[in-house]
């Protein structure tokens, strides 16, 4: 059988400053067990953008309903985009453990920020 895939369908997204950016991510299986997290950038210096369980991410909302059963849509919306938000965003599946370990990453979505229309 095929193992879980993390699908980020958009290679790039362009958003005007002040608008919201939707970053799409779906997975193809509910297993292995473990959370999805979003990061900007790759490697050890990557920045955590959203972790559903812990942390405070006031500009981030999840696209799927919080009560949706068997959810495989882990898309997020980031509000009030500024030029500082530009970068490549990765949707990452973790395998549950102590600690959780990275299982598979999406290919990334590059967010570019256009000037706010005058």
């Amino acid at each position: 059988e095929e193992e879980l895939q993390v699908i980020q369908p958009d290679k790039s997204v362009s958003v005007a400053a002040g608008e919201s950016a939707i970053l799409h991510c779906t997975v193809t299986s509910l297993i292995p067990v473990g959370p999805i997290q979003w990061f900007r950038g790759a490697g050890p210096a990557r920045e955590l953008i959203y972790n559903q369980k812990e942390g405070h991410f006031p500009r981030v909302t999840t696209v799927s309903e919080s009560t949706k059963r068997e959810n495989m849509d882990f898309s997020i919306s980031i509000s009030n985009i500024t030029p500082a938000d530009a970068g490549t965003y990765y949707c990452v599946k973790f395998r549950k453990g102590s600690p959780d370990t990275e299982f598979k990453s999406g290919a990334g979505t590059e967010l570019s920020v256009r000037a706010k229309p005058s």
Epitope: T28, S29, I31, P32, V33, Q52, K53, E65, T67, K68
Partner: antibody, heavy 120, light 108 residues
Framework: EVQLVESGGGVVQPGGSLRLSCAAS????????MSWVRQAPGKGLEWVST??????YYADSVKGRFTISRDNSKNTLYLQMNSLRAEDTAVYYC???????????????WGQGTLVTVSS | EIVLTQSPATLSVSPGERVTFSCRAS??????IAWYQQKPGQAPRLLIY???SRDTGIPDRFSGSGSGTDFTLTISSLQSEDFGVYYC??????????FGGGTKVEIK
């Protein structure tokens, strides 16, 4: 219709072994986590083990003695129980895991259970 | 390990009465609580998940509420088929998944 049917229970002596099976139908077995939950006679529910893909999780009380596995080609969940003790006597339920939103897991379908009795 | 404490252990109720069950967690579990009903000789049945969402086919006389550490299951008007034992379960932090000790509902 989701169906979970356990088998393999019985009477075994302390230190013995049993293998429980759970035949699943009515859903895409291979993409769901599956669990075993037990209930000692007259007692409450106790989680035993969960399996995702090849990721497995155990209660401390059974760690090192029980092994959970699955055969997706047969839509079957297993629990290999070794070094059985009197306190393992219980009805063992197979359960399908469910998730909600970005969170999980709880158990939305249960089998009818199979009784394991450990006694000399 | 998160400990769930259910109270009372037993409730004696007459059909038609409103029934409230309590489940208290030893630490914050957000809304990651499920409720199950178990009748004698039967497997548990999922009633409520995410603290307040009814499972498919569950009558609307069953409702759940709460978040953090204190949760409630309410049956607005108890029917004869509602007698049994009710368990809460947390899935916020596992392993292990933990269940409350149960509340038995018996006929007064």
């Amino acid at each position: 219709e989701v169906q979970l049917v356990e088998s393999g229970g019985g009477v075994v002596q302390p230190g013995g072994s049993l293998r429980l099976s759970c035949a699943a139908s009515g859903f895409s077995f291979s993409i769901y986590a599956m669990s075993w939950v037990r209930q000692a006679p007259g007692k409450g529910l106790e989680w035993v083990s969960t399996i995702g893909a090849d990721d497995t999780y155990y209660a401390d009380s059974v760690k090192g003695r029980f092994t959970i596995s699955r055969d997706n080609s047969k839509n079957t969940l297993y629990l290999q129980m070794n070094s059985l003790r009197a306190e393992d006597t219980a009805v063992y339920y197979c359960a399908k895991d469910s998730t909600v939103g970005w969170s999980g897991d709880f158990f939305d379908y249960w089998g009818q259970g199979t009784l394991v009795t450990v006694s000399s | 390990e998160i400990v769930l404490t259910q109270s009372p252990a037993t409730l004696s109720v007459s059909p038609g009465e409103r029934v409230t069950f309590s489940c208290r967690a030893s630490q914050n579990v957000r809304s990651d609580i499920a409720w199950y009903q178990q009748k004698p000789g039967q497997a548990p049945r999922l009633l409520i998940y995410a603290a307040s969402s009814r499972d498919t086919g569950i009558p609307d006389r069953f409702s759940g509420s709460g978040s953090g550490t204190d949760f409630t299951l309410t049956i607005s008007s108890l029917q004869s088929e509602d007698f049994g034992v009710y368990y809460c379960q947390q899935y916020y932090d596992w392993p292990p998944f933990t269940f409350g000790g149960g509340t038995k509902v018996e006929i007064k």
